[in-house]
């Protein structure tokens, strides 16, 4: 039994780091393998992660962590019974994939403005809480070409757009994802999408020229 592709890990910079690797043949990851991980710090205990299968020869492990600071470094040991297959280390702050934002809501009660709000996926005591920026994706269910991205570069988890920038009388969906420049993170996964019906009533004089108001961002 050998490791074909060494473990690579990403951290949510809060409580979970996910490590993936490939073996040289079909493997029952949960029964045959164990990933031991330990924070390089005083009093830190070794923890054992039981991997799950991720395709025939692929394994994935979710490492649980109480907290994280920038300087953290973990030792990783991949064992098959008494045999050490691989030894490495992992610095969470250098491989961050933020948690996905949640609770995306579209407020349509103001006739000419759409307000999209969502929740920051981190608690206030986490460094990323004040360092996330977002991308909001809005698309039409009826028209695949009507697809736009709004970059939210301020900290507030909200976006206001004029309802007139979208077509009236059709359904739209939105989703949001996050990243943090400070740790040069990857993008988070997209949040679950939310759907609404855009029923903006355009003034009569604009009605015949409504195609001029569709801006793609």
């Amino acid at each position: 039994m050998k490791v074909l592709q060494e473990p690579t890990c990403v951290s949510d910079y809060m409580s979970i780091s996910t490590c993936e690797w490939k073996m040289n043949g079909p493997t029952n990851c949960s029964t045959e393998l164990r990933l031991l991980y330990q924070l390089v710090f005083l009093l830190s205990e070794a923890h054992t992660c039981i991997p799950e299968n991720n395709g025939g020869a692929g394994c994935v492990c979710h490492l649980l962590m109480d907290d994280v600071v920038s300087a953290d470094n973990y030792t990783l040991d991949l064992w098959a019974g008494q045999q050490l297959l691989w030894k490495g280390s992992f610095k969470p702050s250098e491989h961050v994939k933020p948690r996905a934002p949640g609770n995306l809501t579209v407020h349509t009660n103001v006739s000419d403005t759409l307000l999209l709000t969502w929740s920051n996926p981190y608690p206030p005591d986490n460094y990323l809480y004040n360092h996330l920026t977002y991308a909001v994706n809005i698309w039409s269910e009826n028209d695949p070409a009507d697809f736009r991205i709004y970059n939210v570069t301020y900290l507030e988890p909200s976006l206001r757009i004029a309802a007139s920038t979208l077509k009236s009388g059709i359904s739209y969906r939105a989703r949001v994802r996050a990243w943090a420049q400070c740790y040069n993170t990857t993008w988070s996964e997209w949040s679950p999408s939310t759907k609404w019906h855009n029923s903006y009533r355009e003034p009569f004089e604009q009605h015949h020229h409504h195609h001029h108001h569709h801006h793609h961002h």
């Epitope: 600071v69 920038s70 608690p123 005591d125």
Partner: antibody, heavy 116, light 112 residues
Framework: EVQLVQSGAEVKKPGATVKISCKAS????????MHWVKQAPGKGLEWVGR????????IYASKFQGKVTITADTSSNTAYMELSSLRSEDTAVYHC?????????WGQGTLVTVSS | DIVMTQTPLSLSVTPGQPASISCRSS???????????LEWYLQKPGQSPQLLIY???NRFSGVPDRFSGSGSGTDFTLKISRVEAEDVGVYYC?????????FGQGTKLEIK
């Protein structure tokens, strides 16, 4: 041996500012969060705030916001807490504590007395 | 802010007898990572506090096994199975799950 050694007792007049230090040995403060805890005479423990020494990210309890500034110098492995606009109710022992992720190591405490 | 309420506020126990201190939080102290950062500290006279229990039930290194922690949700308990003279001092519960972190008001343990 792990130790947090705090600066000595201070006596200050109302309105003054005081800065107390907490020097760590036996570990690197970059590997922990450094917290400060207040204990007024004959009273209980009160969490003041904390810093991540690597990036300087601080959080304070709301009642200490504007009163306290926590800083850290990783080159000297030292955390600091500054108290401004001192009043009699700031008289207390202030403890520095490292948390990773619980308060395993405490400084001996620094008594700050505010008296005219 | 989460309020941590300890009962009783003082306790007088005969050596060799058990003691129990309760700590109730005003709301859930489960962190968004799923852990409950409820800790117990003992401050002996003239000393800085020392860690006894972390994450509700885990005894810190070097803490005698007569100390045990239990509880969940908002109700937590520290038990000393057989009190010894060296156990005197003030016991504090603490929640480190939600900012601002908060201590209980303390329970003073005396020996009869």
């Amino acid at each position: 041996e792990v130790q947090l050694v705090q600066s000595g007792a201070e006596v200050k007049k109302p309105g003054a500012t005081v800065k107390i230090s907490c020097k760590a040995s036996g570990f690197n403060i970059k590997d922990t969060y450094m917290h400060w805890v207040k204990q007024a005479p004959g009273k209980g423990l009160e969490w003041v705030g904390r810093i991540d020494p690597t990036n300087g990210y601080t959080i304070y309890a709301s009642k200490f916001q504007g009163k306290v500034t926590i800083t850290a110098d990783t080159s000297s492995n030292t955390a600091y807490m500054e108290l401004s606009s001192l009043r009699s109710e700031d008289t207390a022992v202030y403890h520095c504590v490292s948390r990773r992720p619980w308060f395993a190591y405490w400084g001996q405490g620094t008594l700050v007395t505010v008296s005219s | 802010d989460i309020v941590m309420t300890q009962t009783p506020l003082s306790l007088s126990v005969t050596p060799g007898q058990p003691a129990s201190i309760s700590c109730r939080s005003s709301q859930s102290i489960v962190h968004s990572n799923g852990n409950t950062y409820l800790e117990w500290y003992l401050q002996k006279p003239g000393q800085s506090p020392q860690l006894l229990i972390y994450k509700v039930t885990n005894r810190f290194s070097g803490v005698p096994d007569r100390f045990s922690g239990s509880g969940s949700g908002t109700d937590f308990t520290l038990k000393i199975s057989r009190v010894e003279a060296e156990d005197v001092g003030v016991y504090y519960c603490f929640q480190g799950s939600h900012v601002p972190y908060t201590f209980g008001q303390g329970t003073k343990l005396e020996i009869k």
